[in-house]
């Protein structure tokens, strides 16, 4: 048992039949000694007597909260949750696998340029009793602080007969050292707490790997006198690291034809223009990465060729 | 370079650029396989790090481009040698087109850059000899490349800048 | 819904015996304490006897030595064992449980029976 805030503890227990559970031991937080009676939750039913109150922990139905009492005024209370541990690996009832990029990922996490602000999201298909509390760091034997605002609900979506709930929360490192190399990762660290049962679970990266930039912004379209090519031009986006001289994107441009068949070329270029044959009908597209580390591209821009 | 001249920018944009190219065609999976593990703090101080102090941002570029090149060079020749070591030159071999070796010769080439002939700065120890399990091997050289990727990321940036704002 | 429902309250002669049982029935995720109170006519309601979730059983001064409480938690049922018996033990006898309930799964609240009638003559 440990102590997850003021009176609220985290019982861990081996879950499986029989499990003999653990020994509780819940002290009345009171000077006084005499006529003290113990309930639970909003029963006003007496599990005992006396400062200490011991109990067998074995299962949700002995979690909840304890409440100690004299002369029918409550003294303080203590709030058991459990956290199951199943073959020896803690559950992770509460939040979805989002499988990607590889399995058991139940927490992902973005950047949209190196300022050591990133945003974190998970999947529920939980919609009620249910609260979330985040904590990260830089390293973990010797933390460096990284500062998370309030966890929101970003998007409610159906699924099948499912809704799905996505959280997400936005975290800011201290001291950010945009042009250094990260020697230790960032720790994302999310507590989830339904009802009675609570998990944790956890993320570790380096921002240079979550980088995503915002799509390429301000795509223009020039027609090229007698020739069917056109002249394209986009820009950094905004949200992109500056100066773009020392933080620089290479782009992916393409031209897609109606037909979702139509072959289409992909060009690679540093560049913020390109000469492409752009017919009607068709889309011109592009998106960016990080010139010098391969980590994700952004989502495409697209304007139509006509 | 030592002693305050300017490095060939261009050149070494060029160079550092294909670096980075090098280095991911070398072990291009690397953003899906976590090679983190307990007690990573500690190994990953044994390789060379572009730090916060280092003056390699734009604003310690501008006022004094010696200490960050000083740095890049250390972290070049040090990476230089852990690709020449029998980590990559023992079992399992390498494959015979595998891009280890110009990346190796590479790495010698830019570091040349930084210091011309007749100059000689220190530079830091080799690290610990190699593991000799062949499993061993091939995971240290995956954690090697992984934080090469970075390294090389810092610098061919450097290198942008300087060449963007910096050369004459 | 949930119900309550006590038996084994009848006529019985001071010094003899009585088992009372109750049990719990429809949507119950779990039951924590179970518990037997008493009423006297004109007199207010008393408990008697309360055994937590983990079989521990707790006396009123008058039920001491003289009544055994105990459970089964896998059938939802609380029982009371009243030996030697005297005519102060006359009183409509409820059954008590604090129980979730899907609706309140991580609350338990209490539930009475509707209560059995032990008459003792003397």
């Known amino acids: 048992i440990w102590e997850l805030k003021k009176d609220v503890y985290v019982v861990e227990l081996d879950w499986y039949p029989d499990a003999p559970g653990e020994m509780v031991v819940l002290t009345c937080d009171t000077p006084e000694e005499d006529g003290i009676t113990w309930t639970l939750d909003q029963s006003g039913e007496v599990l005992g007597s006396g400062k200490t109150l011991t109990i067998q922990v074995k299962e949700f139905g002995d979690a909840g909260q304890y409440t100690c009492h004299k002369g029918g005024e409550a003294l303080s209370h203590s709030l058991l949750l459990l956290h199951k541990k199943e073959d020896g690996i803690w559950s992770t009832d509460v939040l979805k696998d989002q499988k990607e990029p590889k399995n058991k990922t139940f927490l992902r996490c973005e950047a949209k340029n190196y300022s050591g602000r990133f945003t974190c999201w998970w999947l529920t298909t939980i919609s009620t009793d249910l609260t979330f509390s985040v904590k990260s760091s830089r390293g973990s034997s010797n933390p460096q602080g990284v500062t998370c605002g309030a966890v929101t609900l970003s998007a409610e979506r159906v699924r099948g007969d499912n809704k799905e709930y996505e959280y997400s929360v936005e975290c800011q490192e201290d001291s950010a050292c945009p042009a250094a190399e990260e020697r230790l990762p960032i720790e994302v660290m999310v507590d989830a707490i339904h009802k009675l049962k609570y998990e944790n679970y956890t993320s570790s990266f380096f921002i240079r790997d979550i980088i995503k930039p915002d799509p390429p912004k301000n795509l223009q379209l020039k027609p090229l006198k007698n020739s069917r090519q056109v002249e394209v031009s986009w820009e950094y986006p905004d949200t992109w690291s500056t100066p773009h001289s020392y933080f620089s994107l290479t782009f992916c441009i393409q031209v897609q034809g109606k037909s979702k068949r139509e072959k289409k070329d992909r060009i690679f270029t540093d560049k913020t223009s390109a000469t492409v044959i752009c017919r009607k009908n068709a889309s011109f597209s592009v998106q960016a990465q990080d010139r010098y580390y391969s980590s994700s591209w952004s989502e495409w821009a697209s304007v139509p060729c006509s | 370079v030592p002693g305050g001249s300017s490095p060939a920018w261009a050149q070494c944009q060029q160079l550092s650029q294909k670096l980075c190219t090098l280095a991911w065609s070398a072990h291009p999976l690397v953003g899906h396989m976590d090679l983190r593990e307990e007690g990573d703090e500690e190994t990953t101080n044994d390789v060379p790090h572009i730090q916060c102090g280092d003056g390699c941002d734009p604003q310690g570029l501008r006022d004094n481009s010696q200490f960050c090149l000083q740095r890049i060079r250390q972290g070049l020749i040090f990476y230089e040698k852990l690709l020449g070591s029998d980590i990559f030159t023992g079992e399992p071999s390498l494959l015979p087109d595998s891009p280890v070796g110009q990346l190796h010769a590479s790495l010698l080439g830019l570091s040349q850059l930084l210091q011309p002939e007749g100059h000689h700065w220190e530079t830091q120890q080799i690290p610990s000899p190699s593991p000799s399990q062949p499993w061993q091997r091939l995971l240290l050289r995956f954690k090697i490349l992984r934080s090469l990727q970075a390294f090389v990321a810092v610098a061919a940036r450097v290198f942008a800048h300087g060449a963007a704002t910096l050369s004459p | 819904e949930v119900q309550l429902v006590e038996s084994g309250g009848e006529l019985v002669q001071a010094g003899g015996s009585l088992r009372l049982s109750c049990a719990a029935s429809?949507?119950?995720?779990?039951?924590?304490?179970m518990a037997w109170y008493r009423q006297a006519p004109g007199k207010q309601r008393e408990r008697v006897a309360t055994i937590t979730r983990g079989g521990t059983p707790d006396y009123a001064d008058s039920a001491k030595d003289r009544f055994t409480i105990s459970r089964d938690n896998a059938k939802n049922t609380v029982s009371l064992q009243m030996n030697n018996l005297k005519p102060e033990d006359t009183a409509v006898y409820y059954c008590?449980?604090?129980?979730?309930?899907?609706?309140?799964?991580?609350?338990?609240?209490?539930?009475w029976g509707q209560g059995t009638q032990v008459t003792v003559s003397s």
């Open positions: 008590k449980a604090a129980l979730r309930t899907p609706t309140h799964d991580y609350n338990y609240y209490d539930y």
């Open positions: 429809g949507s119950i995720v779990s039951i924590s304490a």
